[in-house]
């Protein structure tokens, strides 16, 4: 058993049918010694008397808010949450496995640049009685500071019969140098509580591996005289790290017909312009990627050929 | 990525082309190592990230773009002095800091070159003959060092009398390749920045 926050305790349990459970001793936070009784949640049934209460915690029915009283007055509370260990693995019932890039990916994180700012998000099918708290650091043995905001509900989607809820959080490394070579990963820890169930999720990454630039901006077409060709030009996204000559991007230019089945013409370039043939009803799209470290491509920025 | 490769202009900053080749070569070598050593801890998540140049060179600090020198998090008090007469500096007026930067890059390359050659000698003794260092990568390191053209003491190749532990050598190869790839990215960024300056 350990304290999650004031008066909230997590009981770690080997979780299988008929498991023996854990013996927990609760102590009433009071100078009083006599006449103390204990109750659980809203029930008025007295579970025991005395300054301490010993309980065998085996299932969710044994968790909840234990209260000690004296003569009708509440003395203190202890909220017991359960953390299930199924066959030696901590349970992951609250969050949905996003399975990208691999199984057991519950947290996904992205950064738009090398400033040390990043966003993480996760999914759940649970809509009520749910709280999250997020902590982060650079490294774990001698952790350096990363400040995270509060997790917020960022999207709701309908998936088949189920509603899916996306939560996200923004974090900022306290003293980040965009040019630094990372040797210690960023660690992100999310505590999730649903009713009386506690779970924790972690992710470990280097900012360089979660970079996903914003799409190129100001995408423009300039027809070339007496030709079906057009000059496509664009600019680096505002959110990308500067100077651009140091934090360079590479670009992929794609000409896509109206039908998805039509052949796509693709050109790769390090410049911020390219000459392509514009077909009728086609569209031109450009996306960006760090020129030197192949993390994710940005989403496409698109303009119609007409 | 199989992208069309731009040929450098004759008047281009001479080291840019070599640094691009370096990054391509180390990335290919790392990919080959990951595939060949699939049952070894060789991914970024599995290895310890060690920098063999730590406390010996200060490439990131010495090569910091001017725009980032205002960022206190980027300024490190480590000062290392280097020899300052490189041919990449030819045909341009360069500051002391730029010379320091390029000589720091040269020292990095020299240290990695020694480590890789020592490691390759061990890998050649492996009865499994599972993996060797790409000669192209070693040649590209050499070319960039020649282009930088710093006069520096030759570091003797380390020789070891004890029987090599091939498992450990292969794990060390992965660690070294990951670190060298990160440094090659920094070198490429620096060359691109200097070329635009």
């Amino acid at each position: 058993i350990w304290e999650l926050k004031k008066d909230v305790y997590v009981v770690e349990l080997d979780w299988y049918p008929d498991a023996p459970g854990e013996m927990v001793v609760l102590t009433c936070d009071t100078p009083e010694e006599d006449g103390i009784t204990w109750t659980l949640d809203q029930s008025s049934e007295v579970l025991g008397s005395g300054k301490t209460l010993t309980i065998q915690v085996k299932e969710f029915g044994d968790a909840g808010q234990y209260t000690c009283h004296k003569g009708g007055e509440v003395l203190s509370h202890s909220l017991l949450l359960l953390h299930k260990k199924e066959d030696g693995i901590w349970s992951t019932d609250i969050l949905k496995d996003q399975k990208e890039p691999k199984n057991k990916t519950f947290l996904r994180c992205e950064a738009k640049n090398y400033s040390g700012r990043f966003t993480c998000w996760w999914l759940t099918t649970i809509s009520t009685d749910l709280t999250f708290s997020v902590k982060s650091s650079r490294g774990s043995s001698d952790p350096q500071g990363v400040t995270c905001g509060a997790a917020t509900l960022s999207a709701e989607r309908v998936r088949g019969d189920n509603k899916e809820y996306e939560y996200s959080v923004e974090c900022q490394e306290d003293s980040a140098c965009p040019a630094a070579e990372e040797s210690l990963p960023i660690e992100v820890m999310v505590d999730a509580v649903h009713k009386l169930k506690y779970e924790n999720y972690t992710s470990s990454f280097f900012i360089r591996d979660i970079i996903k630039p914003d799409p190129p901006k100001n995408l423009q077409l300039k027809p070339l005289k007496n030709s079906r060709q057009v000059e496509v030009s664009w600019e680096y996204p505002d959110t990308w790290s500067t100077p651009h000559s140091y934090f360079s991007l590479t670009f992929c230019v794609q000409v896509q017909g109206k039908s998805k089945r039509e052949k796509k013409d693709r050109v790769f370039t390090d410049k911020t312009s390219a000459t392509v043939i514009c077909r009728k009803n086609a569209s031109i799209s450009v996306r960006a990627q760090d020129r030197y470290y192949s993390s994710s491509w940005s989403e496409w920025a698109s303009v119609p050929c007409s | 990525r199989n992208l069309p490769v731009a040929t450098p202009d004759p008047g281009m900053f001479p080291c840019l082309h070599h640094s691009q080749n370096l990054l391509r070569a180390v990335s290919n070598m790392l990919q080959k190592a990951r595939q060949t050593l699939e049952f070894y801890p060789c991914t970024s998540e599995e290895i310890d990230h060690e920098d063999i140049t730590k406390d010996k060179t200060s490439t990131v600090e010495a090569c910091l773009p001017l725009e980032l020198t205002k960022n206190e998090s980027c300024l490190n008090s480590r000062e290392t002095s280097f020899i300052t007469n490189g041919s990449c500096l030819a045909s341009r007026k360069t500051s002391f800091m730029m010379a320091l930067c390029l000589s720091s890059i040269y020292e990095d390359l020299k240290m990695y070159q020694v480590e890789f050659k020592t490691m390759n000698a061990k890998l050649l003794m492996d009865p499994k003959r599972q993996i060797f260092l790409d000669q192209n990568m070693l040649a590209v390191i050499d070319e960039l060092m020649q282009a930088l053209n710093f006069n520096s003491e030759t570091v003797p190749q380390k020789s070891s009398l004890e029987e090599p532990d091939f498992y450990k050598t292969k794990i060390k190869l992965c660690i070294l390749l990951h670190a060298f790839r990160i440094r090659a990215v920094t070198i490429d960024r620096v060359m691109s920045y200097l070329n635009a300056s």
């Epitope: 979780w15 299988y16 049918p17 008929d18 299932e59 969710f60 299930k84 199924e86 066959d87 030696g88 693995i89 349970s91 992951t92 019932d93 609250i94 969050l95 949905k96 496995d97 199984n103 057991k104 759940t124 099918t125 649970i126 | 049952f39 801890p41």
Partner: antibody
């Protein structure tokens, strides 16, 4: 007493479908993840699919992905395995399990 | 996929013998290994989880050890009711995979 009882097995033609059920009792079913494991005649054990307590996380073996669907009804204390496009190699005894307890198994025979 | 290689595939032993069965994972699985016992015509039953933890009600003569890639199930003093087939399983990553089984027969 913990009990897991499978039903729904039988003889089916290749390409056909079956729905297996597993009735759970003696424990709080809704608090536990569950799995289906199969055993071909005279062979070893093969994991088929897993489902978390609230159905939010589901995993399948590659051999059954796209053909089988694991689901549960916590109100009915029942685990299901919907099997479509059945093949001869799916012939096996199918067990539902929540360690350390396994059901007695139900035999599925796919044959023309 | 992670392969679990169990050995021996069968063994003959007498009541009172100490029996050791090994299981080798093709890659590191931490301690996420379970052991099962299956008697002819019956369903398997869990004995050990997390490589070395006995489920409640499992006799103390059964013990498990190991971590990483090498795991062992030991029966300290074989009893008549222990003649069965034993399987190891890794649950470190999907797909979950079982060893081929070890049949423990009466000598």
């Amino acid at each position: 007493e913990v009990q897991l009882v499978e039903s729904g097995g039988g003889l089916v033609q290749p390409g056909g479908s079956l729905r297996l059920s597993c009735a759970a009792s003696g424990f709080t079913f809704s608090d536990y993840g569950m799995v289906w494991v199969r055993q071909a005649p005279g062979k070893g054990l093969e994991w088929v699919a897993s489902i978390s307590s609230g159905s939010s996380n589901i995993y399948y073996a590659d051999t059954v992905k796209g053909r089988f669907t694991i689901s549960r009804d916590n109100a009915k204390n029942t685990l299901y395995l919907q099997m479509n496009s059945l093949r001869a190699e799916d012939t096996a005894v199918y067990y539902c399990a929540r360690n350390p307890y396994w059901g007695q198994g139900t035999l599925v025979t796919v044959s023309s | 996929d992670i392969q679990m290689t169990q050995s021996p595939s069968s063994l003959s032993a007498s009541v009172g013998d100490r029996v050791t069965i090994t299981c080798k994972a093709s890659q590191n699985v931490g301690t996420n290994v379970a052991w099962y016992q299956q008697k002819p015509g019956k369903a398997p039953k869990g004995l050990i989880y997390s490589a070395s933890h006995r489920y409640s009600g499992v006799p103390s003569r059964f013990s498990g050890s190991g971590s990483g890639t090498d795991f062992t199930l030991t029966i300290s003093s074989l009893q008549p009711e222990d003649f069965a087939t034993y399987y190891c399983q890794q649950y470190n990553s999907y797909p979950l995979t079982f060893g081929g089984g070890t049949k423990v027969e009466i000598k």
